[in-house]
């Protein structure tokens, strides 16, 4: 007839994919089963291993992440119950949609994670690492992205994603994304025979430079890179009485944004 | 050698109830889990409950098909389990096993008694 | 509740005959299964456990297999004493739940 075990519980830990528990028999040898179980594996022998005389041990690998698993060690009908979670995995894959970027908005999207998440954090820090905007979006197969609004023009994001399963957190995975420059306003015009004289108004946010460029059919005749500071820019040996495409260019944070004006030079 | 005997079996008629007993020897009772199974003449074998131990609180658990009818209970001290069958049914007509559970080395072992043959007729 | 779905219901062959008898789960109970032995007016007798594990006593012609939600019984070489009605039952979740039973009878 098998004897009742009294056992203490001396280590567990978890990782993403595996768990790791050891437990100390106290007084005689006995016979005991270690078994885990989650909502949805059904419940499994854990194959056991001896340490040393009273310490015993059991490694499982393959688990899912994300994933609370119940460990009972029963003797006859004693148990004693150990409930762990393995740690969320992030996103394997997470971006910002350049197509879907404005000057004051950034949209982000992720595959999701393997295993099992509750929700996902999503933070938003500035070039200086300062904490913008986060949001903490429920776990969803048909909604893995999100746009953060009320940004700033032209400038530098670091957006970071985090997998949150129960109580636990996975590792943060990262990715970066720039606003699109405003344009400029208020483009003026002073026109000459063989010259123009260019002047605008900054728009709102970041801007590196402006590139003003000089057009003829298509063909770049005239050009030029001023600081952001700049707000007017001279054209000359131009031909008298020419029409031109006139297009200003604001850079900053690695995009453009631009405005375009037909202009015309003075007639001899 | 572990021993199970069900007695209190017999006819009854639809409605009334009915109490079996398990008696238990050869094992630690008290540190045991025991459940009650269930075969209808010519049928399969059915769960009907288990209780567990006093450090388990004496927890139990039914079959869908008997909860709120019939109870599970033990007396440690006399090493019995007692199944209380209330507001029976001609469908509950079957004998009556008692089983010991438990869990071994990397084992989970069951032990059987004989059976009692509970026949619900008017 | 997790359903046990037994096949086949009757099964015959003959002795040296390899038998397979499979039990589907509802839904998954690990590895958390039975099999037991039935003959007439006789209480059932456990043969695995574990799914795989034979209890003491069991000739080795009797392997388990399986887990997740399917699951196999096998008798690899018949003997004139096992024909008789096989039982699967798995103890994962309450309420602990059985098959409906395969009879193996002699061809």
């Known amino acids: 007839e098998p004897e009742r075990c009294n056992f203490t519980l001396a280590e567990s830990k978890a990782s993403s994919h595996s768990v790791s528990i050891q437990w100390r028999i106290l007084g005689s040898p006995c016979n005991f089963s270690l078994i885990y179980s989650s909502d949805t594996l059904g419940a499994a022998l854990c194959p056991t291993f001896r340490i040393d005389n009273t310490t015993y041990g059991c490694n499982l690998q393959d688990l899912q992440a994300g994933t609370i698993y119940n460990f009972r060690i029963i003797s006859l009908d004693e148990e004693r119950t150990v409930v762990l979670q393995t740690d969320p995995l992030p996103p394997a894959r997470f971006g910002v949609s350049k197509e879907k970027t404005t000057s004051t908005s950034l949209h982000v999207w992720w595959t999701p994670s393997s295993g099992k998440v509750t929700s996902y954090e999503v933070q938003l820090f500035d070039e200086n690492n300062q904490k913008i905007q986060g949001v903490q979006i429920q776990e969803s197969t048909s909604w893995n992205e999100y746009t953060f609004f009320n940004l700033t023009a032209g400038s530098k994001y670091n957006i970071a994603i985090t997998a949150v399963s129960g109580g636990k957190r996975s590792f943060s995975v990262y990715t970066n994304g720039s606003t699109v420059p405003s344009p400029v306003k208020d483009i003026g015009i002073s026109t000459k025979a063989n010259s123009l004289l260019i002047s605008w108004s900054h728009g709102s946010g970041n801007v590196e430079r402006y590139r003003l460029m000089l057009m003829d059919k298509g063909i770049l005749v005239h050009g030029g890179v001023v600081d952001k500071h700049a707000t007017s820019y001279a054209f000359h040996g131009l031909t008298p009485g020419y029409l031109y495409n006139l297009t200003v260019m604001t850079e900053a944070a690695g995009l453009q944004n631009y405005r375009w004006k037909l202009v015309r030079t003075a007639p001899m | 050698e572990v021993q199970l005997v069900e007695s209190g079996g017999g006819l009854v008629q639809p409605g009334r109830s009915l109490r079996l007993s398990c008696t238990a020897s050869?094992?630690?009772?008290?540190?045991?889990?025991m459940n009650w199974v269930r075969q209808a003449p010519g049928k399969g074998l059915e769960w009907v409950g288990r209780?567990?131990?006093?450090?388990?609180?004496?927890?139990?658990y039914y079959a869908g098909s008997v909860k709120d009818r019939f109870t599970i209970s033990r007396d440690d001290s006399k090493n019995i389990a007692y199944l209380q069958m209330n507001s029976l049914k001609t469908e509950d007509t079957a004998v009556y096993y008692c089983?010991?559970?438990?869990?071994?080395?990397?084992?989970?072992?069951?032990?059987w008694g004989q059976g009692t043959l509970v026949t619900v007729s008017s | 509740d997790i359903q046990m779905t037994q096949s086949p219901f009757s099964l015959s062959a003959s002795v040296g005959d390899r038998v397979t008898i499979t039990c589907k789960a509802s839904?998954?109970?690990?590895?958390?299964v039975a099999w037991y032995q039935q003959k007439p007016g006789k209480a059932p007798k456990l043969l695995i456990y574990?799914?795989?594990t034979r209890h003491t006593g069991v000739p080795s012609r009797f392997s388990g297999s399986g887990s997740g939600t399917d699951f196999t019984l096998t008798i690899s070489s018949l003997q004139p004493e096992d024909f008789a009605t096989y039982f699967c039952?798995?103890?994962?979740?309450?309420?602990?739940?059985f098959g409906g039973g395969t009879k193996l009878e002699i061809k």
């Open positions: 089983v010991r559970d438990y869990y071994g080395s990397s084992a989970w072992i069951t032990y």
């Open positions: 050869g094992f630690t009772f008290n540190a045991n889990a």
């Open positions: 209780i567990r131990t006093k450090s388990n609180n004496y927890a139990t």
């Open positions: 839904q998954h109970v690990g590895t958390a």
């Open positions: 574990w799914a795989s």
């Open positions: 039952q798995q103890y994962s979740s309450y309420p602990f739940t």
